[in-house]
Interface confidence: medium
């Protein structure tokens, strides 16, 4: 599923990203737009063998298990083809744990090149939320 | 146990298309990539691509764009490969397997023949 | 794309002797190396994963070695059903790739 800026906007809300870890809503909708493009089904390879899933690109090699990935840890304790759905309840929750993991949202590095420290409410603009 | 059960034999003619099938049973189908082999005699083995039949995301190998189409049925736990154009470079034996980076599962083959 | 070059191409030994097959990457693939063996009219199968894990039922006189570009499948006292070909394969980026084979056959 691509989603549309306020349709996700509004999904992440209800899914409770809005200000989880002190990252406001339109973090989370500026890193989906330059990791996935609001794709749930983005699927992207690394040269290190990983491969990053879903909405927010998840990594292989920490966070989900592809089967394929050496040594992954798999900390959010999902296959990786969860992340892929058009409901985002597996993105989001594995997200939090990111986010919690102590670099924040410099984990993602679309967030960390193209939206931090940016106007990112710009992204939430005009959303009834 | 894991199996992948590939569909039979196939003589085509050039130019002709054919749709070689992989079907999966004994683990959750949908997430695992399933990966597409060729083997010519003499060429050894080539990695045509794979899909990830969750998603139906598709990679290829550069050599293979626009020869090979992959699809998946999760319904039916079925993975298609489509090879399209054929010529007499497309004889071979086709594999599915199971990708888990290495490839413990494969299924048997499908050989096909292209001939005038 | 990473190139797998195999040697020997073809090796023929008697029942008993030990011999290694050889499996060189054209850059550092790490330990993302793995062999199979393949009889004729069969698919291959998976010996070692990660240059030298043994798959679960597979005889412990194959052993795998190596790491960066260089790597080296055994056979400790060859028997005669492991005579065939033998592929590595590499997973350490795409597109995938295979070397072009060593054919272990009876002298």
């Known amino acids: 599923k691509v989603f549309g800026r306020c349709e996700l906007a509004a999904a992440m809300k209800r899914h409770g990203l809005d200000n989880y870890r002190g990252y406001s809503l339109g973090n989370w909708v500026c890193a989906a737009k330059f990791e996935s493009n609001f794709n749930t089904q983005a699927t992207n390879r690394n040269t290190d063998g990983s491969t990053d899933y879903g909405i927010l690109q998840i990594n292989s090699r920490w966070w989900c298990n592809d089967g394929r990935t050496p040594g992954s840890r798999n900390l959010c304790n999902i296959p990786c083809s969860a992340l892929l759905s058009s409901d985002i309840t597996a993105s989001v929750n594995c997200a939090k744990k990111i986010v919690s993991d102590g670099n924040g949202m410099n984990a993602w590095v679309a967030w960390r090149n193209r939206c931090k420290g940016t106007d990112v409410q710009a992204w939430i603009r005009g959303c009834r939320l | 146990q894991v199996q992948l059960q590939e569909s039979g034999a196939e003589v085509m003619k050039p130019g002709a298309s054919v749709k070689i099938s992989c079907k999966a049973t004994g683990y959750t189908f949908s997430t695992y990539w399933i990966e597409w082999v060729k083997q010519r005699p003499g060429h050894g083995l080539e990695w045509i691509g794979e899909?990830?039949?969750?998603?139906?995301?598709?990679y290829y190998n550069e050599k293979f764009k626009g020869k090979a189409t992959f699809t998946a049925d999760t319904s039916s736990n079925t993975a298609y490969m489509q090879l399209s154009s054929l010529t007499s470079e497309d004889s071979a034996v086709y594999y599915c397997a199971r990708g888990d980076g290495w490839y413990c599962y494969w299924g048997q083959g499908t050989t096909l023949t292209v001939s005038s | 794309d990473i190139e797998l070059t195999q040697s020997p191409a073809t090796l023929s030994v008697t029942p008993g002797d030990s011999v290694s097959l050889s499996c060189r990457a054209s850059q550092s693939i790490s330990n993302n190396l793995h062999w199979y063996q393949q009889k004729p009219h069969e698919s291959p199968r998976l010996l070692i994963k990660?240059?030298?894990q043994r798959m679960s039922g597979i005889p412990s006189r194959f052993s795998g070695s190596g790491s960066g570009t260089d790597f080296t499948l055994s056979i400790n006292s060859v028997e005669t059903e492991d005579f065939g070909m033998y592929f590595c394969q590499q997973s350490n980026s795409w597109p995938r790739t295979f070397g072009g084979g060593t054919k272990l056959e009876i002298k």
């Open positions: 899909i990830l039949p969750g998603s139906g995301s598709t």
């Open positions: 990660y240059a030298s």
